[in-house]
């Protein structure tokens, strides 16, 4: 009786149990009551990254310098080339078929954590005693200058934006 | 022992000015910022304003940067603030207060209570 | 400006329970610069002016009774009173300092049963 159910790594086809084609290779033809199933290597470019039946290997992914792209990860017979963005920039999606430049944080703002390929920068306010007076993807919010410790007093406090002005002691006396 | 006094009250007509005093004791009054607090009756506390008795330094609330003047006497270790035009809306207790750095306020005086009536 | 919001605005209990304050602020008060919270919580007495309890959410000032701890980052944070006393009879206000102009919650109004 012909089987109706196959063991893993096997397909049903013309009612009998056929091997699948294992990662890196493509079917050529199915067996036969006489044959194995027939599979061939994928071309330079190509890969499928299962045990399988298709009859065409999937095209590499390809890095595209003009939407910011290039190759993190070379791909194989198995496994699909994986793009990152260039240095700079990070992925719009997980997908990562293209790429937007990083994120500046604000005068006010400091880089709370460094974008990396995939995600962006995250800036976080400046907070009363720091600031940051320039436009940055790598800049923190810096603590204001201690006046004391250089035996100044503050002449002019500091804001998110600007540090604050020391002067001498005695300048009001 | 740290120490910020304020007068108990002040009674006050309306479109007169008022100036607070807030006398500190126990530390180096130059060294430390001073804030002032407004808290109406039943109300809760709202940030005016601070001054560095150093140079005089000053950081407004924009809310209150036309009704409040900051200055300070350092002979004296007195921080002052003046408030002009007042309307009964201004009648509360005005707080003053040390800053710990610039941030929490760990030395409070015990307030002026501040009357606005014709 | 930050605003501070605190519940319950009041509450009463009765003396040896536990209480649990809490104040929530319109934007994150955590600064990974110093990995400190800008918060602070003071206790107004019938009266008085307010006395500072915690400082950077969750340190106790010097002289505060240790049943008084803060806890909580970010937005939301607690003031906690592990045994209230009659004593503790008294308005609750949360600050932040992590912006001009310095804003404070509305308060929370413990009373005793």
């Known amino acids: 009786e012909p089987p109706t159910a196959c063991r893993e790594k096997q397909y049903l086809i013309n009612s009998q149990c056929c091997s699948l084609c294992q990662p890196g290779q493509k079917l050529v033809s199915d067996c036969t009551e006489f044959t194995e199933t027939e599979c061939l290597p994928c071309g330079e470019s190509e890969f499928l990254d299962t045990w399988n039946r298709e009859t065409h290997c999937h095209q590499h992914k390809y890095c595209d310098p003009n939407l910011g792209l290039r190759v993190q990860q070379k791909g194989t017979s198995e496994t699909d080339t994986i793009c990152t963005c260039e240095e700079g920039w990070h992925c719009t999606s997980e997908a990562c078929e293209s790429c937007v430049l990083h994120r500046s944080c604000s005068p006010g703002f400091g880089v709370k954590q460094i974008a990396t390929g995939v995600s962006d920068t995250i800036c976080e306010p400046c907070p009363v005693g720091f600031f940051s007076n320039v436009s940055s993807a790598f800049e923190k919010c810096h603590p204001w200058t201690s006046c004391e410790t250089k035996d100044l007093v503050v002449q002019q406090a500091g804001t998110n934006k600007t540090d604050v002005v020391c002067g001498p002691q005695d300048r009001l006396r | 022992q740290v120490q910020l006094q304020q007068p108990g009250a002040e009674l006050v007509k309306p479109g007169a000015s008022v100036k607070l005093s807030c006398k500190a004791s126990g530390y180096t009054f130059i060294n430390y910022w001073i804030n002032w607090m407004r808290q109406r009756p039943g109300q809760g506390l709202e940030w005016i304003g601070n001054i560095y008795p150093g140079s005089s330094s000053t950081t407004y609330n924009e809310k209150f940067k036309s009704k409040a003047a900051l200055t300070v006497d350092t002979s004296s270790s007195t921080a002052y603030m003046q408030l002009s035009s007042l309307t009964s809306d201004d009648s509360a207790v005005y707080f003053c207060?040390?800053?710990?750095?610039?941030?929490?306020?760990?030395?409070w005086g015990a307030g002026t209570t501040v009357t606005v009536s014709s | 400006d930050i605003v501070m919001s605190q519940s319950p605005s009041s509450l009463a209990v009765s003396v040896g329970e536990k209480v649990t304050l809490s104040c929530k602020s319109s934007q994150s008060l955590f600064f990974s610069g110093n990995q400190k919270n800008f918060l602070a919580w003071y206790q107004q007495k019938p009266g008085q002016s307010p006395n500072l309890l915690i400082f950077?959410?969750?340190t106790r000032e010097s002289g505060v009774p240790d049943r008084f701890t803060g806890s909580g980052s970010g937005t939301d944070f607690t003031l906690t009173i592990s045994s209230v006393k009659a004593e503790d009879l008294a308005v609750y206000y949360c600050q932040q300092y992590y912006s001009y102009p310095f804003t404070f919650g509305s308060g929370t109004k413990l009373e005793i049963k």
């Open positions: 950077w959410a969750s």
């Open positions: 207060a040390r800053s710990v750095g610039y941030w929490y306020f760990d030395v």
